[in-house]
Amino acid sequence: LPAQVAFTPYAPEPGGTCRLREYYDQTAQMCCSKCPPGQHAKVFCTKTSDTVCDSCEDSTYTQLWNWVPECLSCGSRCSSDQVETQACTREQNRICTCRPGWYCALSKQEGCRLCAQLRKCRPGFGVARPGTETSDVVCKPCAPGTFSNTTSSTDICRPHQICHVVAIPGNASMDAVCTSTSPTRSMAPGAVHLPQPVSTRSQHTQPTPAPSTAPGTSFLLPVGPSPPAEGSTGD
């Protein structure tokens, strides 16, 4: 004969556990049904009656199977420096992430609590480490032979162009200026061509550093010994 299926609520076997999507109610001392995502427990179980679930109200949610008496409140609306990447529904919280040109200075479980504008490296400084979703740009002074003439959160120090004859030497914030040596062009003595490099710049270009952390939001779900908490161990 097949084993009889127990319907909730039921007393677990001594030392046994409740099944998937059930929880052990310590007051009733029974295995009782959890409520599905988007719902919460309106009435807890008794020894003879199972959990009664109800839908989450507007602007509240439950993401996991649970027996919380109240749904969680969705986070406040995204601020002007953020974009809403996930709307508030009965089954998921609103997620706000930082808009382009900003990074997350203070993260929360999902999304970002506080965004800050990415640092801009001023002329004479280039990006040593690009900004990521959760870290700011790191600037460094341009080393001899390199320059940056922009205020930018993305530009790195670039090598000076190499001239046959240098009109104006490069420095950390300005490229070298080459003097024209072509006899075929008629121009006033000392005239400057901007620019007229001899060699291509590509062989001198520094590789762009890889981001220190891969972009992409990481989602953390609560786990652990807080049975009814909406982060109770899920299905």
Partner: antibody, heavy 119, light 106 residues
Amino acid sequence: QVTLKESGPTLVKPTQTLTLTCTFSGFSLSTLGMGVGWIRQPPGKALEWLAHIWWDADKYYNPALKSRLTITKDTSKNQVVLTMTNMDPVDTATYYCARMTGTRYFDVWGQGTTVTVSS
Amino acid sequence: DIQMTQSPSSLSASVGDRVTITCKASQNINKFIAWYQQKPGKVPKLLIHYTSTLQPGVPSRFSGSGSGSDYTLTISSLQPEDVATYYCLQYGVLWTFGGGTKVEIK
């Protein structure tokens, strides 16, 4: 409006049985999720939960007093009755009944009735 | 049985002071805690349930917090009408009240 009112003897002798009745209005014990519990408070002391009964007749008792307590309900009369046997002077207290929500906390209380145990 | 240890047992504070009352459960009660106010000679009145949910009509100066086995009731700015004894109630496993905290005005 939800109201609860306790009634019963104000004086009982040691070893006697106390019978208290809670009569309520504004809700029904046939409604899913409704419950009524009893709590007492000795003079100048803290509250102590005694017993509870749900709409489906499921009952819970304070383990320390379980052998002395019985709780019953009469849904048609909107009443819950608590009996406590073998009364002792230390059981002198104000006895309250209170409504319990489906998520298990007491939200509305009766005015209380004072019971003195003395010979 | 779960024991609830409430502290302090009494306190005296000035009007406008921030007052904090704590309850420690003997085990995790998963936020199933309520707070009651009992004025002298009166019936207990529910202030907060499920750790932090304020009952309708309760002034916003009352707030609750906590998780696991440690819980707090805070009165952000004590008023003369807050003179009372405050009790916590755990309802995670059966029901147990704390010993009470008597709040007086200096």
